[in-house]
């Protein structure tokens, strides 16, 4: 019970979590800037990954999408891929987890089968988050180190002048959605790996005593076969027993003090 | 990489008008406000008027009712319609943008263009 509750706590964390990288990943608000330096109105300017935005005090708004990959900041490319990269193994993962959700019967698959896709599904959904977490990490620290109180001048060799607009370069909601998507994909793994080892059944030996009855060469012993599994080695479904009694394999069986109850 | 080019200007008559125009050209990926500013001889550079991409304006107090700024955003040009030219509007006149370029998306730069003379004398 414990296990099927914790295999479906964590799949519905991580569907959020995947559900807020890919919010994320689509938000427009990545970086926020105030332009100080306009003499006419406040203007807001907001970007994301995939465009960039304008807003005006007076309601005008404007997006423009950076419609060229080769010309863009190798920071920029390197985010979009980490993000796409969790979002692929998000998508995977849960599409895995929802087959090994133990409250599901698919056909005759077993809780081994079971336990194996809980696993897969939880270290995917690990390194969705993981990725997640750089991706916006990487993001956040690029504003923090490159461009945070930009005030620098500089001078065009054709005799006009450019110089940096002062900007606040400030975090936008999306690294905060990402931060926490990816922080709620990440404990939705661990919580699926931790469903897993209960979900893999354990090889149980039951031990038994051989009972003979006397002057008779067949061996009547009850219970001692291990649990299929899959994973051991008893392949020939032997019996178990302890002190080397003999198997059923074995031609005779000789009278001992066990034999007489 | 990125250039403005300012023209328009000129010898012109008390009371007479012209008009400017700055085009911006080069690897621009948008352009927030453009403007003008001006520098007569011996002074500081002062705004004339600017306006912003969605249209809002703003201008000295100087020029109110005789100066209009507009602009192409199609086009990244900006325009000064100069009406009721005064002998004290003689100047050296800027064009200045706000933009990012498409290689940096993510940093603005404030162009200026190499300005144009405005002689107003009879």
């Known amino acids: 019970m414990a296990v099927t509750a914790c295999q479906g706590l964590g799949f519905v964390v991580s569907l959020i979590g995947i559900a807020g990288i890919i919010a994320a990943t689509c938000m427009d608000q990545w970086s926020t800037q105030d332009l100080y330096n306009n003499p006419v109105t406040a203007v807001f300017n907001y970007q994301g990954l995939w465009r960039s935005c304008v807003r005006e005090s007076s309601g005008f708004t404007e997006c423009r999408g950076y419609f060229t990959l080769l010309g863009l900041p190798a920071m920029l490319q390197a985010v979009r891929a980490l993000m796409i990269v969790g979002i692929v193994l998000g998508a995977i993962g849960l599409l895995v987890s929802i087959f090994a959700l133990k409250c599901i019967r698919i056909g005759s698959m077993e809780d081994s089968a079971k336990a194996n896709m809980t696993l897969t599904s939880g270290i995917m959904f690990i390194v969705s988050g993981l990725c997640a977490i750089a991706g916006v990490s990487v993001f956040a620290n690029m504003l923090v180190t490159n461009f945070w109180m930009s005030t620098a001048n500089m001078y065009t060799g054709m005799g006009g002048m450019v110089q940096t607009v002062q900007t606040r370069y400030t975090f936008g909601a999306a690294l905060f959605v990402g931060w926490v998507a990816g922080g709620l994909t990440l404990i939705g793994g661990v919580m699926m790996c931790i469903a897993c080892r209960g979900l893999a059944p354990e090889e149980t030996n039951y031990k038994a005593v051989s009972y003979h009855a006397s002057g008779h060469s067949v061996a009547y012993k009850p219970g001692g076969f291990k649990a299929s599994t899959g994973f051991g080695s008893n392949t020939k479904n032997k019996k178990i027993y302890d002190g080397g009694a003999r198997t059923e394999d074995e031609v005779q069986s000789y009278p001992s003090k066990h034999d007489y109850v | 990489q990125v250039q403005l080019v300012e023209s328009g200007g000129g010898l012109v008559q008390p009371g007479g008008s012209l008009r400017l125009s700055c085009a911006a050209s080069g690897s621009i990926f948008l352009i927030n406000a453009m403007g003008w500013y001006r520098q007569a001889p011996g002074k500081q550079r002062e705004l004339v008027a600017v306006i912003t991409r969605g249209g809002s304006a703003n201008y000295t107090d100087s020029v109110k009712g005789r100066f209009t700024i507009s602009r192409d955003n199609a086009k990244n040009t900006v325009y000064l319609q100069m009406n009721s030219l005064k002998p004290e509007d003689t100047a050296v006149y800027y064009c200045?943008?706000?933009?990012?370029?498409?290689?940096?998306?993510?940093?603005?730069?404030?162009?200026w263009g190499q300005g144009t003379q405005v002689t107003v004398s009879s």
């Open positions: 200045n943008a706000d933009l990012n370029l498409r290689s940096d998306p993510f940093k603005w730069y404030t162009f």
